[in-house]
């Protein structure tokens, strides 16, 4: 007898993993045999689609390799022409073992910055993500957090954060581990022990000591008066990320020695500097009686400034006056490289004439000071802004007392050309006279385009530099 179709086994929800087999059963009793059709989300499934298998005359629908997109509602409809068609529906829930879609990568990070190690996952149910550092689960704290995305964020990275990390994605179906990655924490070069300044006798041996640290371990270079150290021996040792450099010198002249620690972070460098002065005892004591002699200037620095064949006063309180005074000019001259184009020629003229003073030969060779008017012209017109900075540093004791020649001349204490025209020296480069005084640039135009350089600061009377940091 004909019998209308009855679905004896209604469809159930099927959970399946990606790439697994999923089967829906729609057992039907009827006579004659029914035609069974299947739909997914109300769209007819083509029964000859090779992704599906139909068995038992359509009563079994098998998805041979489940994909994410197979998720949905599946319905079977049975019809044999007797009575109405019958339908049963069930859901396919595509489950997925955890999969790490964006694994972490090795990271080099500078101490104090923020590091983010990615760990993006897929899975159904949504995997929970945790992290392992070394062999232990990583604990979150105020600096370290696992983001909603699964990524690990470390604020204000510290040296102790360095190590091996891996993320773990877990759900009810399984666990996925990322490969182990390395977090390397780099630290800017920093000077732990700055070289100390020394006041020694001529011909002494002095060892300057400079200790620095950083990750990677920095290299130390020594600079003497702005140039690479030309003499002396350097010994270095490295232990526990600390580099120790010792520069041994045979002292024949005063100098400024700078220890520069440098390390590299990717394409950039970090640098720390510390400096010390070596002065020679009795080298620069002011003499009540002018001990010295007149001689033609044979140096290089002031060649363009001093008159050709000019007689200059060489101070015999220095063991080697020519060398010493040239060094003083050279050191100061280097500091003038960054002043404004308006100020620089005037300052250079003042500096050379201040250190290599014009000499009046006679029974007692006498230095001739610069005329007050020329000094004031430099101070108030050409280098007004720079002068203020220099004076301020002098008053705050930022220039050491022994290097008085480098300090700014006190214009008010210099003789005026109006008192005795022969008692003071003029600065021919400034062409200073009443007629062309109006050619001096106005005060406003004397502002330097670059601030005066930060000259080394001092602690007590010895010349030293606090470590400074820079990235280039």
């Amino acid at each position: 007898l004909p019998k209308a179709p009855v679905i004896t086994t209604p469809l159930e929800t099927v959970d399946a993993l990606v790439e697994e087999v999923a089967t829906f059963m729609c057992a039907v009793e009827s006579y004659p045999q029914p035609e069974i059709s299947w739909t997914r989300n109300k769209i007819l499934i083509k029964l000859f689609d090779t992704r599906y298998s139909i068995r038992e005359n359509g009563q079994l629908l098998t998805i041979l390799s489940v994909e994410d997109s197979d998720d949905g509602i599946y319905c079977c409809t049975a019809n044999n022409g007797v009575g109405g068609a019958v339908e049963s529906c069930g859901a396919l829930q595509v489950k997925m073992k955890p999969k790490i879609t964006r694994p972490p990568i090795n990271v080099k990070i500078i101490e104090g910055l923020k590091a983010v190690l990615p760990c993006t996952t897929m899975g159904n149910p949504k995997p929970s993500v945790s992290w392992i550092k070394g062999d232990s689960p990583l604990r979150e704290n105020s600096r370290i957090a696992v983001l909603e995305s699964g990524s690990l964020r470390i604020h204000n990275v510290q040296k102790e954060d360095a190590g091996q990390y891996r993320c773990v994605a877990k759900n009810s179906l399984g666990t996925a581990y990322s490969k182990v990655v390395k977090l390397e924490v780099e630290v800017f070069a920093r000077i732990l022990r700055a070289p100390e300044s020394h006041n020694v006798t001529f011909g002494s041996f002095v060892t300057l000591h400079c200790t620095a640290t950083g990750i990677p371990v920095p290299t130390i270079t020594w600079i003497e008066n702005g140039n690479a150290v030309s003499s002396g021996s350097i010994q270095e040792s490295v232990k526990d990320r600390v580099i120790d450099s010792r520069l041994q010198l045979f002292i024949t002249k005063p100098g400024l020695y700078t220890c520069i620690a440098t390390n590299k972070h990717g394409e950039k460098f970090s640098t720390a500097k510390a400096a010390a002065t070596i002065s020679i005892a009795e080298w620069s004591k002011p003499q009540k009686d002018n001990k010295g002699y007149c001689a033609q200037y044979r140096g290089e620095v002031c060649n363009a400034v001093l008159a050709k064949d000019a007689l200059v006063f060489l101070n015999t309180s220095y063991a080697d006056p020519e060398e010493a005074q040239e060094l003083l000019v050279h050191t100061a001259w280097n500091e003038l490289k960054v002043v404004s184009p308006v100020c620089r020629p005037a300052a250079e003229a003042l500096l050379c004439n201040h250190i290599f003073q014009e000499c009046s030969p006679g029974v007692v060779p006498t230095p001739i000071p610069i005329c007050r008017e020329y000094c004031l012209a430099v101070k108030e017109l050409f280098c007004a802004k720079e002068w203020l900075v220099m004076e301020e540093k002098t008053h705050r004791g930022l220039y050491r007392s022994e290097m008085h020649l480098l300090s700014v001349p006190e214009c008010s204490k210099l003789p005026s050309m109006h008192w005795d025209p022969t008692a003071c020296a003029r600065l021919p480069h400034l062409d200073y006279n009443k007629e062309n005084l109006k050619t001096f640039p106005p005060m406003t135009s004397s502002k330097p385009s670059v601030d005066i350089p930060n000259l080394p600061s001092s602690s007590s009377s010895s010349f030293s530099v606090s470590p400074t940091y820079s990235m280039t």
Epitope: A16, T23, Q33, E56, N57
Partner: antibody, heavy 121, light 107 residues
């Protein structure tokens, strides 16, 4: 009583062909899915192929795909397995089995006695 | 394909013993699991279908359980005629894979 009787086995050289038959009786053959299952000497059971009641759907094990063909003749109550390009590893007893699907998942509720196929040079 | 793994491969037991054979599927197969018994030189015989349903004419000392991936065939009290090879089979996918078999021998 359900009865399945296989025939057509024998000795064949590698690369040769053979056609197995399975005669069915005692049930309405035309309404059942049918299968071939084989068993190599001293080994376990291996499903080979299946065919739906009206020959609409045919399935094969990967090991025989492209070499074996399953067919049926409902008028003659017969199931066939055409085996081409035979290999030594096809040596086995071949069983035909009825697929019963009611009140539960598919299962092979009736089996023939088997026919031996030997592939050897 | 779905792989079926049976354990143990062989088993020695005595008449009257309670015996358990397990079968594990490589993925979830709901209850699409059948158990067969085969004696030397004979065709396999269906014992249990749908993981736990006893086939008509099979003694009640045979029982099956499990769902998903792990299944068990239990013989509550071994009889002399029960010494044979037992196979599990999945019918969830159209490849109808069998386990490798468990040979039950007399101790």
């Amino acid at each position: 009583e359900v009865q399945l009787v296989e025939s057509g086995g024998g000795l064949v050289k590698p690369g040769g062909s053979l056609r197995l038959s399975c005669a069915a009786s005692g049930f309405t053959f035309s309404t059942y899915t049918m299968h071939w299952v084989r068993q190599a000497p001293g080994k376990g059971l291996e499903w080979v192929s299946s065919i739906s009641s009206r020959s609409a759907y045919k399935y094969y094990a990967d090991s025989v795909k492209g070499r074996f063909t399953i067919s049926r003749d409902n008028a003659k109550n017969s199931l066939y397995l055409q085996m081409n390009s035979l290999r030594a590893e096809d040596t086995a007893v071949y069983y035909c089995a009825r697929d019963f699907f009611q009140l539960g998942p598919p299962r092979f509720d009736s089996w023939g006695q088997g026919t031996l196929v030997t592939v050897s040079s | 394909d779905i792989q079926m793994t049976q354990s143990p491969s062989s088993l020695s037991a005595s008449v009257g013993d309670r015996v358990t054979i397990t079968c594990r599927a490589s993925q979830r197969i709901s209850s699409f699991l059948n158990w067969y018994q085969q004696k030397p030189g004979k065709a396999p015989k269906l014992l249990i279908y749908g993981a736990s349903n006893l086939q008509s004419g099979v003694p009640s000392r045979f029982s099956g359980s499990g769902s998903g991936t792990d299944f068990t065939l239990t013989i509550s009290s071994l009889q002399p005629e029960d010494f044979a090879t037992y196979y599990c089979q999945q019918s969830y996918s159209p490849s109808y894979t069998f386990g490798q078999g468990t040979k039950l021998e007399i101790k």
